[in-house]
């Protein structure tokens, strides 16, 4: 006799208004009496509709939450599994049931903002900027909302960057406990003459940090050939261990680059009689603290003004 189990009931994908953080939920299947004592596990697969691969999780719960790109639709499917302990070793699963979440197609794509860029300056404040849609009426204006886990609900930007009295960006500070988790943004718009398509963005703040440039550069030469360069980590909340540095050294007309995770570097002069010895440095958050980052601006150049003769110190 073939053992069968029913799929979960009432599978649906819900939007609680958190700008892309969706709830996938379902109810337990109708279970026949002989399996009442068995543990049910649910295999859930989901993806944005343009994705090649499904994300798969197994849960004993009746809800799962995750972040999605709301610029595209979402589809999911779920089935019930019975433990082999309950089925004499055979793998028993229900048929799949499916659900989808369609994005709003209100407003043409040409009305959606363009070139959304966000930078988390010195791990202290976030600046996002955008350009208006390609074809929008002159009364169109945009509004930015954001959410991350820890906020009760999505919040609107309170400090807009403006151009010609239109919102073209937003500055956010005091983002407590907002890094190392998905940060969701929606920029929607309004016009009396046409609907405006919303734009959604998701990233993690630590991956878009642009630090301040290093400061207090110092260069010295020992034994007339050993160059020692040092600098200070910029002020602010980024721990010193999180920086990586790129250094450009200039000796007369020759320049070369080097890299380090420390805030000093030693190397040999290329020519004893060189008259000009300078360096400058920039920094970025390293791979131990983020998956990505943005290089700081270059520091001011620092030059060694010492005497180039053989007895110089």
């Amino acid at each position: 006799l073939e053992i069968k189990v029913n799929p979960p009931q009432d599978f649906e994908i819900l939007d609680p208004g958190l700008l892309g953080y969706l709830y996938l939920q379902w109810k337990p299947p109708v279970v026949i009496e002989k399996f009442k004592g068995c543990t049910l596990e649910y295999e859930l697969k989901y993806r944005n509709v343009d994705s090649d691969s499904w994300k798969t999780i197994i849960t004993r719960n009746l809800i799962y939450k995750d972040g999605f790109d709301l610029n595209k639709g979402i589809e999911g499917k779920i089935r019930t599994h019975l433990s082999e302990h309950c089925t004499n070793g055979s793998e028993v699963q229900s048929p799949w049931i499916e659900a989808s979440y369609g994005i709003s197609d209100e407003g043409s794509l040409e009305t959606k903002i363009q070139d959304m860029k966000c930078i988390y300056y010195n791990w202290q404040y976030l600046v996002c900027s955008w350009k208006p849609g390609k074809t929008v009426y002159s009364d169109t204006n945009y509004t930015m909302f954001f959410w991350y886990e820890g906020l009760d609900h999505a919040l609107q930007c309170a400090d807009y960057l403006q151009h010609d009295e239109k919102n073209v960006g937003c500055k956010l500070s005091n983002l407590d406990s907002s890094d190392y988790k998905d940060f969701f943004i929606c920029v929607n718009g309004s016009s009396k003459l046409e609907p405006i398509r919303s734009s959604y963005t998701v990233f993690q703040l630590q991956n878009i940090v642009k630090p301040l440039p290093p400061e207090f550069l110092h260069i010295s030469v020992e034994n007339s050939i050993d160059i020692r360069m040092k600098w200070s980590t910029p002020g602010g909340p980024i721990p010193p261990r999180c920086y990586t540095y790129e250094i450009v050294i200039r000796e007369d007309d020759i320049s070369w680059e080097s890299a380090t995770d420390k805030n000093d570097m030693k190397l040999k002069r290329r020519a004893n009689e060189s008259e000009d010895l300078c360096f400058f440095v920039r920094c970025k958050v390293n791979i131990y603290c983020a998956d990505d980052g943005i290089w700081s601006e270059w520091s001011e150049e620092e030059c060694w003004e010492g005497y180039t003769g053989p007895d110089s110190k």
């Epitope: 543990t39 295999e43 999780i57 197994i58 004993r60 719960n61 082999e84 302990h85 070793g89």
Partner: antibody, heavy 121, light 108 residues
């Protein structure tokens, strides 16, 4: 008496490969799901991978996905972990563990004694 | 991923003491939680499964309670053999299966 016996650990260079085995006895091997769990020196427990009783479904931690492959041979009562592109951070004692009940995972009621994998140049 | 946070990280106690270790899940995991004991150089040993069910052969001085996000392991009267590191583990939703960072119970 339930027994799980790991083997195959050792010293390997970064980028190298190893295959761990876990020989099981004392229970009907094809029934429970099985997992590999590792413990870096002086650190806590980290789940690595799981496989259902039939071997039909496998699951991995993000840190090993695409590099490690879990498999089982129910006719030989043996669980395997093929580890490729090994990194220094994979250095750990690797335990195989039996799921008490559950299709893919659960509480682990029996553990092997562990096999040490050291990734170093 | 579901994060599991144990407290305290280290606990100093004496034989005969009542000891409580807490484990907090970052989201509800119903009662799908296990507790393990591990001694240096040894494999972990299952003590409690499904939050409160005592594994066969485990002394009754060990008990587990809680559901949702807050769980506790209690040792009613600490014995010399109980000085070890204890881990909680969720198996509600995976991958990944996640463990707490461990609580070391040491002699005061």
């Amino acid at each position: 008496e339930v027994q799980l016996l790991e083997s195959g650990g050792g010293l390997v260079q970064p980028g190298g490969s190893l295959r761990l085995s876990c020989a099981a006895s004392g229970f009907t091997f094809k029934l429970p799901a099985m997992s590999w769990v590792r413990q870096a020196p002086g650190k806590g427990l980290e789940w690595v991978s799981a496989i259902t009783g039939s071997g039909g479904s496998t699951y991995y931690a993000d840190s090993v996905k695409g590099r490690f492959t879990i498999s089982r041979d129910n006719s030989k009562n043996t669980l395997y972990l093929q580890m490729n592109s090994l990194r220094a951070e994979d250095t750990a004692v690797y335990y195989c563990a039996k799921v008490r009940y559950g299709w893919g995972a659960g509480a682990f009621d029996y553990w092997g004694q562990g096999t040490l994998v050291t990734v170093s140049s | 991923d579901i994060q599991m946070t144990q407290s305290p990280s280290t606990l100093s106690a004496s034989v005969g003491d009542r000891v409580t270790i807490t484990c907090r899940a970052s989201q509800s995991i119903s009662s799908w939680l296990a507790w393990y004991q591990q001694k240096p150089g040894k494999a972990p040993k299952l003590l409690i499964y499904d939050a409160s069910s005592l594994e066969s052969g485990v002394p009754s001085r060990f008990s587990g309670s809680g559901s949702g996000t807050e769980f506790t392991l209690t040792i009613s009267s600490l014995q010399p053999d109980d000085f070890a590191t204890y881990y909680c583990q969720q198996y509600d939703t995976y991958p990944p299966i996640t463990f707490g960072q461990g609580t070391k119970v040491e002699i005061k």
